[in-house]
Structure formats: structure tokens, C-alpha cells
């Protein structure tokens, strides 16, 4: 087909220590020679679809997918990944080819998949398909650790069935709440699989290998804590092991602990007890409830009782498949230039999610915090007051979730102007979107008060840059205004900004900023 553009698809691998990567996602520095990905026309597909050779990437590697388009005129484009659209800014190289880039920083499982690039040129529309996968994903795995009781010993073994074999460590903490964060001095780490000291406040086991780090907390009910207003909830998938620890401290040994499931005592062999005297001669007892492989009928209220403490319960829910529950409706926010603001997503999920925040094709680390009501929250505050589209993406073994946010920054318009032989155009990105006026400056109107209404064409939001709308106004040149100074003004509720343009014969156009 004569009309089809000449397309070249390339892969650029960035060295990991390349400080240039990510500084500008539109124009990444080339670290190594680009690898040609072919981009052949896909036969028997509806529409024009080019398919690049499959791309295999190491975990944590940084790459750029790049398309070079040899087609006349302007092009516009859109990237789509996992049903999320990411806007793209084409630019032109020295050979006047359109260049479209997608930077993927520190490749993770989340970023693997099909990247679709839709390009619209003056002549035709076409689609380019990239398939990106992680090298060795079939060989490498990292599974969440789980617990087993050590045969004939009061100890727990931590197991993570991962490849390559992970380093397993216990993370122990004996204080409450915030002071049990990983970096805290109250936290003790033991790089071993077996743990005998099971009386601590907070016990976690973590496994790490090349793919990262996964942790599992030993679910605990502490009868010395005031009963919560919301029952703690524990989710497990069918076949996973259940471990709940009940802990109580009393002035002497004259108390016992019991576990019940829905008011029935747990069967012999599904619990074991340990006790010790603490330094101040009080007695600590712990009672473990465990099921080596849970079934649906293990769902219910597990209650730990003591004759000397208020009883407490946890709701254990056994599910067939993991889930992520959250509202996925997109949210728009409008803030002032110096207003403190964070995006936040509240969700309930099992197993624990991996997540990222993305803005303008850059991914940012995602932190999660557990709330008392069984929900978790992830916040993103590092937007640096840049308007646009922000994406929260979360996934676990069984589910995926994406939520879009738009951030608008209230500010006075700033005007940029450009002119050609036949027209003058002004652009502004102020918010709320500005309205436009054009004025003619002449002997009769030295203050440029004579309004121009003929030949003006306003376009609201004609190009969307990462979700940031830009407004433009174009004045078609007529004999009546040739050779005159004209002034375009953009105004919104926060103020007005103007630019003065001399409409002379073709050539360089002087612009005068006038605020």
C-alpha cells in the first residue's frame, strides 16, 4: 500500500547506573545501540496493525520502546497498557521522522504485558503492538512464606517455596504500633528458618530473592489489649495453612486459654500451648490455633477465651481466589498551587498487593498502610503540584486493579504565542480553562482596546498532555489587521495574561509578554 508510512520499531536498553534514564521520559538518553524490533505488518488483522518482535527484559532493567515514523505532516498518538491510556508526545528527529517513546523504568512483573501504540497521521491511522515480558519469569518465583510447626518441638518453621531459593528471616518486635517499623531499633532480625521465641508482640517471616521480598505476619490476638471496635479479619485461600496466635499475660499461672470456632472447641491437634515467665515474674501464655490446609468450612469466628481476660474474636474468611476490593471510579481534584494534597486509595485485598503510582510514564514507589478496620490505604503525595493524570495500579496473584486520578492546579493563565503567514495562535495551560480575547493596537487604539471578533477560532483543550488540558485561540489574518500589533489575552478567575504579536509579512515574529 503506497499510503502506508515507513515504520521502524527499536528497543533501547539502559544501563542500570544510567542517571539519564527518567530525567525526561520523552527524550531518553541512548545508553546502548538501539535494537531493531522489525515491526512487520500483521496479516489478517482488521485495520493496519504492525507487530514488533517480542521483548524480553531482565527484572529491574530500564528500557525504552521507540517508534520512528517516516510520514508526511503531523502525527498524534496514544499508548494503551492494561486498559489504561497513557498520553504520548511525539517529537521529530533531524531526519524529520516522528519519534514516539515509552520509557519503562526498573522493570517489574506489573509492567510486563502488551503495549499498544495508536498513531494518527494526516494520511492514515495505524496500531503498533509491543509485547514485553520478564526474562526467566517461568523459572524465577517468589512465594509468600507460610508457617509449619516443627515436629516434636515448640517452634515454628518458616517456608517459602521460591526459585532461586530465598533467604528466610524472622522479623521480631516487642513494642507496639509505629515503633515496629522495619528501620526501628525495636526490631530484631534473625536469618534462620526455625523460630523458638514465640512470645513476642509482633512476629513476621520474610523471604527474599532476586525478585524481591515477601513477608507474612503471624496473626495475633492479644487479650491484654482493649477489645477493638472492629473485629480483626484474616483472609486465606483454600489450601493455605491457617495460624492464629492468642496471647495473654497475667500476674500468676492461674488461668488458661481456649480456642473456639463458632462456639465449638477446636479439635485436638489443631492447637498447641506454650507458656513462660517474663522478667517481672508474670506468666505469659500463648495458644496457637492452626489448620494445615484450610477448606471453605474453616470460615467463621475464632474466639480466644481466658478466665482472667475479656475474650476476643477474629473473623477468618476462606476464599477460592484472591481479590482486590476498592472503588475504581476516576477522581478529579482541583487544588491551589501551594496547597498540601495527597491522592489516596482505600482497599481491601488478599493476598497483599504490589502497587505503583504512575505519572507521565514514570513509575513511583507505592507504600501501603494497614488500617484498623481491615482495609489498607496507599497515598501518593509526591506530585510536586504537576497537573495531569495519575494512575494507581495494584495487583496480586489473582486480581488487578487500576484507578485514575486527575489533578488540576488552579493558576492564572500563562500565554505562549506563535504565528505563521496566515494566522497567529496563542496557547495557555491555566486552570480553570481560560477564555480568550483578541485586541488590535492602532493609532485609534494605542492601548489595544479595539476588540477583534472576526476570524477568531477558540479550541478548548485541543491537546491533552498527560491529562493536562491546554486551551488555544487562533486568529486568521485578514488584510484589515496585517502589519498591526495584536494582543491575545487569556483570562480565568485567577487573573489575566496577554501576549502581543506583530502581524507583518512572513518572517520572524516578535512577541511581547504583557502581564
Amino acid at each position: 500500500n503506497q499510503d502506508l508510512p515507513v515504520i521502524k520499531c527499536v528497543l533501547i536498553n539502559h544501563k542500570n547506573n544510567d542517571s539519564s534514564v527518567g530525567k525526561s521520559s520523552s527524550y531518553p538518553m541512548v545508553s546502548e545501540s538501539p535494537e531493531d524490533l522489525g515491526c512487520a505488518l500483521r496479516p489478517q488483522s482488521s485495520g493496519t496493525v504492525y507487530e514488533a518482535a517480542a521483548v524480553e527484559v531482565d527484572v529491574s532493567a530500564s528500557i525504552t520502546l521507540q517508534v520512528l515514523v517516516d510520514a508526511p505532516g503531523n502525527i498524534s498518538c496514544l499508548w494503551v497498557f492494561k486498559h489504561s491510556s497513557l498520553n504520548c508526545q511525539p517529537h521529530f528527529d533531524l531526519q524529520n521522522r516522528g519519534v514516539v517513546s515509552m520509557v519503562i523504568l526498573k522493570m517489574t512483573e506489573t509492567q510486563a504485558g502488551e503495549y499498544l501504540l495508536f498513531i494518527q497521521s494526516e494520511a492514515t491511522n495505524y496500531t503498533i503492538l509491543f509485547t514485553v515480558s520478564i526474562r526467566n519469569t517461568l523459572l524465577y518465583t517468589l512465594r509468600r512464606p507460610y508457617f509449619r510447626k516443627m515436629e516434636n518441638q515448640d517452634a515454628l518453621v518458616c517456608i517459602s517455596e521460591s526459585v532461586p531459593e530465598p533467604i528466610v528471616e524472622w522479623v521480631l518486635c516487642d513494642s507496639q504500633g509505629e515503633s515496629c517499623k522495619e528501620e526501628s531499633p525495636a526490631v530484631v532480625k534473625k536469618e534462620e528458618k526455625v523460630l523458638h521465641e514465640l512470645f513476642g508482640t509482633d512476629i513476621r517471616c520474610c523471604a527474599r530473592n532476586e525478585l524481591g521480598r515477601e513477608c507474612t505476619r503471624l496473626f495475633t490476638i492479644d487479650l491484654n489489649q482493649t477489645p477493638q471496635t472492629t473485629l480483626p479479619q484474616l483472609f486465606l485461600k483454600v489450601g493455605e495453612p491457617l495460624w492464629i496466635r492468642c496471647k495473654a499475660v497475667h500476674v500468676n499461672h492461674g488461668f488458661g486459654l481456649t480456642w473456639e470456632l463458632e462456639n465449638k472447641a477446636l479439635e485436638e491437634g489443631n492447637y498447641f500451648e506454650m507458656s513462660t515467665y517474663s522478667t517481672n515474674r508474670t506468666m505469659i501464655r500463648i495458644l496457637f490455633a492452626f489448620v494445615s490446609s484450610v477448606a471453605r468450612n474453616d470460615t467463621g469466628y475464632y474466639t480466644c477465651s481466658s478466665s482472667k481476660h475479656p475474650s476476643q474474636s477474629a473473623l477468618v474468611t476462606i476464599v477460592e481466589k484472591g481479590f482486590i476490593n476498592a472503588t475504581n471510579s476516576s477522581e478529579d481534584y482541583e487544588i491551589d498551587q501551594y496547597e498540601e494534597f495527597c491522592f489516596s486509595v482505600r482497599f481491601k485485598a488478599y493476598p497483599q498487593i504490589r502497587c505503583t503510582w504512575t505519572f507521565s510514564r514514570k513509575s513511583f514507589p507505592c507504600e501501603q498502610k494497614g488500617l484498623d478496620n481491615g482495609y489498607s490505604i496507599s497515598k501518593f503525595c509526591n506530585h510536586k503540584h504537576q497537573p495531569g493524570e495519575y494512575i494507581f495500579h495494584a495487583e496480586n496473584d489473582d486480581a488487578q486493579f487500576t484507578k485514575m486520578f486527575t489533578l488540576n492546579i488552579r493558576r492564572k493563565p500563562q500565554v505562549l504565542a506563535e504565528a505563521s503567514a496566515s494566522q497567529a495562535s496563542c496557547f495557555s495551560d491555566g486552570y480553570p480553562l481560560p477564555s480568550w480575547t483578541w485586541k488590535k493596537c492602532s493609532d485609534k487604539s494605542p492601548n489595544c482596546t479595539e476588540e477583534i471578533t472576526e476570524g477568531v477560532w477558540n479550541r478548548k483543550a485541543n491537546r491533552k498532555v498527560f491529562g493536562q488540558w491546554v486551551s488555544s485561540s487562533t486568529l486568521n489574518m485578514s488584510e484589515a489587521i496585517k502589519g498591526f500589533l495584536v494582543k491575545c489575552c487569556a483570562y480565568n478567575s485567577l487573573g489575566t495574561s496577554c501576549e502581543t504579536i506583530l502581524l507583518n509579512s512572513p518572517g520572524p515574529f516578535p512577541f511581547i509578554q504583557d502581564n
Epitope: 473485629l231 462456639n263 469466628y301 474466639t303 474474636s313
Partner: nanobody
Framework: QVQLQESGGGLVQAGGSLRLSCAAS????????IDWYRQAPGKQREWVAQ???????HYEPSLKGRFTISRDNAKNTAYLQMNSLKPEDTAVYYC?????WGQGTQVTVSS
């Protein structure tokens, strides 16, 4: 499904007494423990007392001696007897079984 309904709240002078009731529907009443909580205006909900299925009682330490929790399994009802009431006892009082809650009953203690 358990349904709970509190009653017995009202306006009382400081130093006076009130007896709150928590009536439950559902066959598991006798097998479950019952907690009373309260929530004063603008404050977090706080635990008050508990009675276990075996009749053992536990209290928020600052309330022990003034408040008494009891239950009548035949009537599927739990009670909270409150004596020597103080203005700071003004709150909505709720009973709870597992994660089922009642609607609450208002207790107002005037000075």
C-alpha cells in the same frame, strides 16, 4: 444473623442509676460473649465491659465498682447496671456480639 436492640437509656441526675438492656435475636446468644461499648460526642467508641458465655465478667478498670454486667440466657438479654453516674458517663451505649452491633441507647447525666 444476630440482631441486637438496646434500651433503658435516658436522662438522669449525677449520682443516679440506670439499667440498660440488650435484647438479642438468634439462637447463639447463650454461647457468645457480650460486650458493652460507649461513645461520647466527638470521641472514639470505648470498651466498657464484657460477660463471657460462662458468666465471667470483665470491666474497663476505671469503671469497675460502679458498673455491673449480667445476662439472662432464658430471655436472650444482657444488662448493664450503672450506679453513681457522673456527667462524663454521658454517651451512646452499644452492645456487641461478635461483629454484630445494636443501634445504641442514649444516656445523659446532668450535673
Amino acid at each position: 444473623q444476630v440482631q441486637l436492640q438496646e434500651s433503658g437509656g435516658g436522662l438522669v441526675q449525677a449520682g443516679g442509676s440506670l439499667r440498660l438492656s440488650c435484647a438479642a435475636s438468634g439462637s447463639t446468644f447463650s454461647k457468645n460473649y457480650i460486650d458493652w461499648y460507649r461513645q461520647a460526642p466527638g470521641k472514639q467508641r470505648e470498651w466498657v465491659a464484657q460477660i463471657t458465655s460462662g458468666g465471667n465478667t470483665h470491666y474497663e478498670p476505671s469503671l469497675k465498682g460502679r458498673f455491673t454486667i449480667s445476662r439472662d440466657n432464658a430471655k436472650n438479654t444482657a444488662y448493664l447496671q450503672m450506679n453513681s453516674l457522673k456527667p462524663e458517663d454521658t454517651a451512646v451505649y452499644y452492645c456487641r456480639i461478635l461483629d454484630y452491633w445494636g443501634q445504641g441507647t442514649q444516656v445523659t447525666v446532668s450535673s
